[in-house]
């Protein structure tokens, strides 16, 4: 359905508030270093222009594509060359190359200061003084730090952010009301950003076939009562939505996401019995609710999977007629029967099944050949089951902090070339899998754990792509999306790594250590642990534990001292010398 003016079409569909919010997000995700005021100015100019097009779709420039309009606007920024360097060269290109160029310059790890949370009274005053600016600032700050954040979902976060301030700034104890809500939004926001980053990586690095396979598996688990044709329709629509958002087409993405929510709510009976409570909610909340909806119950009396996909003599005929449809149906049938499997495992099984059919359908006796597919599946299923069991036992034994430390050591030994901040960030997040998943019943552990690990490892891949330092990481990240986690799990100590020279400065600490929050103290200690392993990659667990225990004791002692700085200056070198001796 074509429109004379695309910008007018989207403005009318989305409404002014959402239109402005999405344009601000789009601009902030592209030009991550620009000041807030500059973005607000650009957004206001685009909005005023959109209004002229709504009034008269034939007005000058109203027929231009959104990429052309937005790109032209971004290229008016005066300091583009000074602030962004070679990104300014994008402006010499024509669409669609210009937009592709902007996309390639999105920075997953922008050099931006961490967001500092002001005092509650200061925030409440700012909220009351100018609510609109306060909320725009939130969108801007999140979007520029998370350039692939799912834009329509960010509008939902902003709505919750607004609601939290509206409620808590009137409460008797503002801080007690507000701070837990802000913590929750921050944690949920980081998780949402990381999940979306994996979707975009899947689409951009492995193509829409990979994303569609993921979506078939996940939606079949969620909607096991839905027919294959229904799941396929949802997958097609969902792929379009995420392709648009990952491609920077945020207005189209939000519009199509709203259409998808509308469709799902109008067709609940043929999708899932769990959608009812979502469909009564307002748009942003409804879309979020639908995305997070729990799995429906498995239908009674599902027929044998083996009958159609192994025992039937028509397997090769059906496969040859429409390979992707047949494999899609296999994945759908397998996934709807297995809510207890991770999506990544289901995709590995589908891949193994495909490889078996490719081999066997060319064999003398295809049926006898593909009957052996069962033997190939068992180790694929048991590997993540065993991994989850072992790591949950370790987590329960150690607790989160020490479990993170075990993973820090494990991953530093695997890929010691990776930067210390990246190893600390990724290992800390890998370690959070314990608290997130190990408390769940057995049937929910694997999907929780492995699919979460896929998200965290994607962060490692994305950061490593920006500054590649390890062939092993590149190999695990690029060879196969579904085998990333098993690839990293299989890595051993890097024997070729030349240990890092000892640098006393790395292990020099000061009194400021004592004023850090518990989390910041942990990060400091974990940074030292990574550096220790890089220096002595063959150090045993016992040796490392001894050093870390001494470190904790040394910090505790000096933080209790009257002259803390003097203590650090005196005890620090002793700790370093003792550590070197312990690791010799």
């Amino acid at each position: 359905d074509t429109h004379k003016s695309e910008v007018a079409h989207r403005f009318k569909d989305l409404g002014e508030e959402h239109f402005k919010g999405l344009v601000l997000v789009a601009f902030s995700q592209y030009l991550q270093q620009c000041p807030f005021e500059e973005h607000v100015k650009l957004v206001n100019e685009v909005t005023e222009f959109a209004k002229t097009c709504v009034a008269d779709e034939s007005a000058e420039n109203c027929d231009k594509s959104l990429h052309t309009l937005f790109g032209d606007k971004l290229c008016t920024v005066a300091t583009l060359r000074e602030t962004y360097g070679e990104m300014a060269d994008c402006c010499a290109k024509q669409e669609p190359e210009r937009n592709e160029c902007f996309l390639q310059h999105k920075d997953d790890n922008p050099n931006l200061p961490p967001l500092v949370r002001p005092e509650v009274d200061v925030m409440c005053t700012a909220f009351h003084d100018n609510e609109a600016t306060f909320l725009k600032k939130y969108l801007y700050e999140v979007a520029r730090r998370h350039p692939y954040f799912y834009a329509p979902e960010l509008l939902f976060f902003a709505a919750r952010y607004k609601a939290a301030f509206a409620e808590c700034c009137q409460a008797a104890d503002k801080a007690a009301c507000l701070l837990p809500k802000l913590d929750e939004l921050r944690d949920e926001g980081k998780a949402s950003s990381a999940k979306q980053r994996l979707k975009c990586a899947s689409l951009q690095k492995f193509g829409d076939r990979a994303f569609k396979a993921w979506a078939v598996a996940r939606l079949s688990q969620k909607f096991p009562k839905a027919e294959f044709a229904e799941v396929s329709k949802l997958v097609t629509d969902l792929t379009k939505v995420h392709t648009e958002c990952c491609h920077g087409d945020l207005l189209e993405c939000a519009d199509d996401r709203a259409d998808l929510a509308k469709y799902m709510c109008e067709n609940q009976d043929s999708i899932s019995s769990k959608l009812k409570e979502c469909c009564d909610k307002p748009l942003l909340e409804k879309s979020h609710c639908l995305a997070e909806v729990e799995n429906d119950e498995m239908p009674a009396d599902l027929p044998s999977l083996a009958a159609d996909y192994v025992e039937s003599k028509d397997v090769c005929k059906n496969y040859a007629e429409a390979k992707d449809v047949f494999l899609g149906m296999f994945l759908y049938e397998y996934a709807r029967r297995h809510p207890d499997y991770s999506v990544m495992l289901l995709l590995r099984l589908a891949k193994a099944y495909e490889a078996t059919l490719e081999k066997c359908c060319a064999a003398a006796d295809p049926h006898e050949c593909y009957a052996k597919v069962f033997d190939e599946f068992q180790p694929l299923v048991e590997e993540p089951q065993n991994l989850v069991k072992q790591n949950c036992e370790l987590f329960e034994q150690l607790g989160e902090y020490k479990f993170q430390n075990a993973l820090l050591v494990r991953y530093t030994k695997k890929v010691p070339q990776v930067s210390t901040p990246t190893l600390v960030e990724v290992s800390r997040n890998l370690g959070k899998v314990g608290a997130k998943c190990c408390k769940l019943p057995e049937a929910k552990r694997m999907p929780c754990a492995e699919d979460y690990l896929s998200v965290v490892l994607n962060r490692l891949c994305v950061l490593h792509e920006k500054t590649p330092v390890s062939e092993k990481v590149t190999k695990c990240c690029t060879e196969s999306l579904v085998n990333r986690r098993p690839c990293f799990s299989a890595l051993e100590l890097d024997e070729a790594y030349v240990p890092k020279a000892f640098n006393a400065e790395t292990f020099t600490f000061h009194a400021d250590m004592c004023t850090l929050s518990e989390k910041e103290k942990q990060v400091k200690k974990q940074t030292a642990l990574v550096e220790l392993v890089k220096h002595k990659p063959k150090a045993t667990k016992e040796q490392l534990k001894g050093v870390m225990d001494n470190f904790a004791a040394f910090v505790e002692k000096c933080c209790k001292a009257d002259d803390k700085e003097a203590c650090f200056a005196e005890e620090g070198p002793k700790f370093v010398a003792a550590s070197q001796a312990a690791l010799a």
């Epitope: 009674a300 009396d301 192994v310 397998y334 297995h338 052996k372 069962f374 033997d375 089951q385 057995e442």
Partner: nanobody, 124 residues
């Protein structure tokens, strides 16, 4: 990793009934399907019935349809086979089997874990 123990076999007259039970222990969370196979002297092991412990799907060999009923209890990780209208051709060692996936397969290779077997003899 998963142990299966069968019980309930024995000698029965043609036309009689017997109930076989099988209890799984160990890493039972990894089990999805449980089934029964049988092997008569000098013959290959053959599929009898299977059930998906987490749903209510069942599957039977044509030779036992209407006479045998399989039922599973996910909470207790047990499976039972109620055998009615027994005939001498049902004489065999009956094996309980467990699979890590929901295939409801007839092929023994789909099943990762096996019991020791229990003898069922139907006399005429």
């Amino acid at each position: 990793q998963v142990q299966l123990v069968e019980s309930g076999g024995g000698l029965v007259q043609a036309g009689g009934s017997l109930r076989l039970s099988c209890a799984a222990s160990g890493r039972t969370f990894s089990i999805y399907d449980m089934g029964w196979f049988r092997q008569a002297p000098g013959k290959e092991r053959e599929f009898v019935a299977a059930t998906n412990l987490r749903g209510v799907s069942t599957r039977y060999a044509d030779s036992v349809k209407g006479r045998f009923t399989i039922s599973g209890d996910n909470a207790k990780n047990t499976v039972s086979l109620q055998m009615n209208s027994l005939i001498p051709e049902d004489t065999a060692v009956y094996y309980c089997a467990a699979a890590v996936s929901n295939w409801l397969a007839k092929d023994p290779s789909a099943y990762s874990y096996w019991g020791q077997g229990t003898q069922v003899t139907v006399s005429s």
